[in-house]
């Protein structure tokens, strides 16, 4: 039994880091493998992660962490019984994938303005709370070409757009994702999408 693709890990910078790797053949990850991880600080103890299958030869493990700070570094040991298959390390602050925003809501009752709001996925005492910026994706269910991205570079989790920038009388969907420049993170997953019917009064045209 050998590791074909070494574990790569990403952290949500809150409580979970996810490590994925591939074995050289079909593997029952949960029964055959264990991933041990230990924070490199005095008085820290090793913890065991039981991996799950992620495709025939792929494994994934969710490492639980009480909290994360920038100085944290973990040793990782991948075991198959008594055999050490791989040894490495992981610094969560250098491999951050933020949590996805939640509670995306489209408020359509503000005159001819659409107000989109969502929730910051982090609590106020987490470092990322004040460092997230967002991308909002809006698309038409009827017209695949009607697809747009709005970059929200301020901290407030909201976006206002004129309803007239979208077509009237058809349904749209929106979703939002987050990233943090300070840690050069990857983008989060997209939030669940929300749907609304776009309608507004066309301005009266005089001839």
């Amino acid at each position: 039994m050998k590791v074909l693709q070494e574990p790569t890990c990403v952290s949500d910078y809150m409580s979970i880091s996810t490590c994925e790797w591939k074995m050289n053949g079909p593997t029952n990850c949960s029964t055959e493998l264990r991933l041990l991880y230990q924070l490199v600080f005095l008085l820290s103890e090793a913890h065991t992660c039981i991996p799950e299958n992620n495709g025939g030869a792929g494994c994934v493990c969710h490492l639980l962490m009480d909290d994360v700070v920038s100085a944290d570094n973990y040793t990782l040991d991948l075991w198959a019984g008594q055999q050490l298959l791989w040894k490495g390390s992981f610094k969560p602050s250098e491999h951050v994938k933020p949590r996805a925003p939640g509670n995306l809501t489209v408020h359509t009752n503000v005159s001819d303005t659409l107000l989109l709001t969502w929730s910051n996925p982090y609590p106020p005492d987490n470092y990322l709370y004040n460092h997230l910026t967002y991308a909002v994706n809006i698309w038409s269910e009827n017209d695949p070409a009607d697809f747009r991205i709005y970059n929200v570079t301020y901290l407030e989790p909201s976006l206002r757009i004129a309803a007239s920038t979208l077509k009237s009388g058809i349904s749209y969907r929106a979703r939002v994702r987050a990233w943090a420049q300070c840690y050069n993170t990857t983008w989060s997953e997209w939030s669940p999408s929300t749907k609304w019917h776009n309608s507004y009064r066309e301005p009266f045209e005089q001839h």
Epitope: F41, L42, L43, S44, E45, D66, D67, V69, S70, A71
Partner: antibody, heavy 117, light 107 residues
Framework: EVQVLESGGNLVQPGGSLRLSCAAS????????MSWVRQAPGKGLEWVSS????????YYADSVKGRFTISRDNSKNTLYLQMNSLRAEDTAIFYC??????????WGQGTLVTVSS | EIVLTQSPSSVSASVGDRVTITCRAS??????LAWYQQKPGKAPKLLIY???ILQRGVPSRFSGSGSGTDFTLTITRLQPEDFATYYC?????????FGPGTKVDIK
């Protein structure tokens, strides 16, 4: 809210024994190392002992090694310090502290141990 | 064991002053250093850990810096509640050790 509360401090004669307790609440006790730190009257802080979250590893200052024993009962969220062969120089306020990465994030109010004849 | 030396041992300052306290380790300790504040009759309180990380709830006028053997605690605008004794502590190796303390009192 994290809370740690020491008890068991008392006046004891040289050579005597005492057991301190520390009741913890507001966090997952078994996930964190715990420590004892003491402060002699009018003096600075001195680390005494630490124990890992599982209780599997213990560490002591040279000044108490062989005389003091740290232990924990994770089912009761309680930390202990058994102190034997006490000396006058052990007189101090003993603080229980919740450890995180080797640092003492939360402290109790302390319990006074006086060793005197 | 690692010996920590603090300077000054005491400092007299006024409200609004900038106060700097240094802690020097007898050997390199990377960033494994914390700062605590203690007021008379009270338990110590963690201010800074891992040299520069502010503990939750601690005012931003407190900051820490340094790595290796030389570390600094800075209070940018001293407030009345900041008059206390400050200790550094290393967590790089056993036994954990504290500095002797720096007393900040009113000028």
């Amino acid at each position: 809210e994290v809370q740690v509360l020491e008890s068991g401090g008392n006046l004891v004669q040289p050579g005597g024994s005492l057991r301190l307790s520390c009741a913890a609440s507001g966090f997952t006790f078994s996930s964190y190392a715990m420590s004892w730190v003491r402060q002699a009257p009018g003096k600075g802080l001195e680390w005494v002992s630490s124990i890992t979250g599982s209780g599997g590893s213990t560490y002591y200052a040279d000044s108490v090694k062989g005389r003091f024993t740290i232990s924990r009962d994770n089912s009761k969220n309680t930390l202990y310090l058994q102190m034997n062969s006490l000396r006058a120089e052990d007189t101090a306020i003993f603080y229980c502290a919740k450890d995180n990465r080797g640092f003492f994030h939360y402290w109790g109010q302390g319990t006074l141990v006086t060793v005197s004849s | 064991e690692i010996v920590l030396t603090q300077s000054p041992s005491s400092v007299s300052a006024s409200v609004g002053d900038r106060v700097t306290i240094t802690c020097r380790a007898s050997q390199g300790i990377s960033n494994r250093l914390a700062w605590y504040q203690q007021k008379p009759g009270k338990a110590p309180k963690l201010l800074i850990y891992i040299a520069s990380i502010l503990q939750r709830g601690v005012p931003s006028r407190f900051s820490g810096s340094g790595s290796g053997t030389d570390f600094t605690l800075t209070i940018t605008r001293l407030q009345p509640e900041d008059f206390a004794t400050y200790y550094c502590q290393q967590a790089n190796s056993f036994p954990f050790t504290f500095g002797p303390g720096t007393k900040v009192d009113i000028k």
